[in-house]
Interface confidence: low
């Protein structure tokens, strides 16, 4: 069998809401994946599991099942949404994200995604990790790749 290539393209949109009483930020982050089937037979994308981390803490998880079938030598673009919550010990971020004196409230999030594909009863998992900028201060739609966090240095521990 030939390879199945998974490429994490980036954040497509981030929709934000706040709870002033709980000092909590809710971010619905939609991501885009390109999945390429290099085989001469169809492949089923069985599930996508994703999680988002902020400052080494998991703030959101999502799982999509029975997603699609990719034909021979074909590519499909798949969007998936991860609901995230920044709260409790990270509630200090609430003030940053709601400060009107700041125009762009970018935070760095680590996107992790695992794609499970099946063909002829065989299962294969491909994982990706990527750091992305997301604006926690307003609803934002991104040009694909625009939210890439290019700095090779990891966020401080």
């Amino acid at each position: 069998p030939r390879s199945i290539d998974v490429k994490y393209i980036g954040v497509k949109s981030a929709y934000v809401s706040y709870d002033v009483q709980k000092r909590t930020i809710y971010l619905n982050i939609t991501n885009t994946l390109n999945i390429t089937n290099n085989n001469y037979y169809s492949v089923e994308v069985e599930n996508i599991t994703a999680q988002v981390q902020f400052s080494k803490t998991v703030i959101g998880k999502a799982r999509l099942n029975n997603i699609t079938i990719i034909g021979p030598l074909d590519m499909k673009q798949i969007d998936y949404t991860v609901p995230t919550v920044i709260a409790e010990e990270m509630s200090y971020m609430y003030d940053f994200c709601t400060l009107i004196s700041i125009k762009v409230h970018n935070i760095v999030l680590m996107m992790q995604v695992t794609v499970t594909t099946t063909y002829f009863g065989h299962s294969e998992q491909i994982s990706q990790e990527r750091y992305q900028y997301v604006d926690c201060g307003r609803n934002t739609t991104y040009q694909l790749g625009q939210s890439e966090y290019l700095n090779v240095l990891q966020p401080q521990q």
Epitope: S17, Y18, V20, Q21, D95, T98, L99
Partner: antibody
Framework: QVQLQQPGAELVKPGASVKLSCKAS????????MHWVRQRPGQGLEWIGN????????HYNHKFKDKATLIVDKSSSTAYLQLSSLTSEDSAVFYC????????????????WGQGTSVTVSS | DIVMTQATPSIPVTPGESVSISCRSS???????????LFWFLQRPGQSPQLLIY???NLASGVPDRFSGSGSGTAFTLRISRVEAEDVGVYYC?????????FGSGTKLEIK
């Protein structure tokens, strides 16, 4: 239309407890915080606390912490205020009022109020 | 706790006149997100309170535009232009920036 239905009156003996109800209709119960407010005869309004019906998250005025318990029953869209160890000082009208969801830009908060339940503590 | 002060217990007014009701808070109610978390309520005799103004200056649904709210972070004013007989009652300010939420003691509007 939005309605918050409260019983008109409750007569309770000193030392007893009472559970006041506030039945919500005309909106999605779990999308709106429910607040409780006390008004003693001839006095002003005092905020007792509130509860988020979606997850039962509560906040209390510390003044009422040992006196009041807020609970909800999602299946019947009803909020309850339980008052314990009642004395004549607890005689008052108790209002429930809903506010919009917690989003910081939430607009018309505490926009609907019940008619209030008059609690009289007397032997 | 944030203390809300309504220093004027009652205001007599003639129908058709304008009136201002004041309220002060012991701490600024201006949040970093730009909103000022102050309500104004009217409680007519024998009735439940009714929301008039939210976030200091926003008119609640169904409230006549004779009512308006203004203020800074700690000093607030409810203005009623052309007072009508139905405006009588007790006016309360309330902060909902911090728990516990707190009300002012109320200002009674009376017709002369």
């Amino acid at each position: 239309q939005v309605q918050l239905q409260q019983p008109g009156a409750e007569l309770v003996k000193p030392g007893a407890s009472v559970k006041l109800s506030c039945k919500a209709s005309g909106y999605t119960f779990t999308n709106h915080w429910m607040h409780w407010v006390r008004q003693r005869p001839g006095q002003g309004l005092e905020w007792i606390g509130n509860i988020d019906p979606s997850d039962s998250d509560t906040h209390y005025n510390h003044k009422f912490k040992d006196k009041a318990t807020l609970i909800v029953d999602k299946s019947s869209s009803t909020a309850y205020l339980q008052l314990s160890s009642l004395t004549s000082e607890d005689s008052a009208v108790f209002y429930c009022a809903r506010s919009r969801g917690g989003y910081y830009d939430y607009g018309e908060a505490m926009d609907y109020w019940g008619q209030g339940t008059s609690v009289t503590v007397s032997s | 706790d944030i203390v809300m002060t309504q220093a004027t217990p009652s205001i007599p007014v003639t129908p058709g006149e304008s009136v201002s009701i004041s309220c002060r808070s012991s701490k600024s109610l201006l949040h970093v997100n730009g909103n000022t978390y102050l309500f104004w309520f009217l409680q007519r005799p024998g009735q439940s309170p009714q929301l008039l103004i939210y976030r200091m200056s926003n008119l609640a649904s169904g409230v006549p535009d004779r009512f308006s709210g203004s203020g800074s972070g700690t000093a607030f004013t409810l203005r009623i232009s052309r007072v009508e007989a139905e405006d009588v009652g007790v006016y309360y300010c309330m902060q909902h920036l911090e728990y516990p939420f707190t009300f002012g003691s109320g200002t009674k509007l009376e017709i002369k």
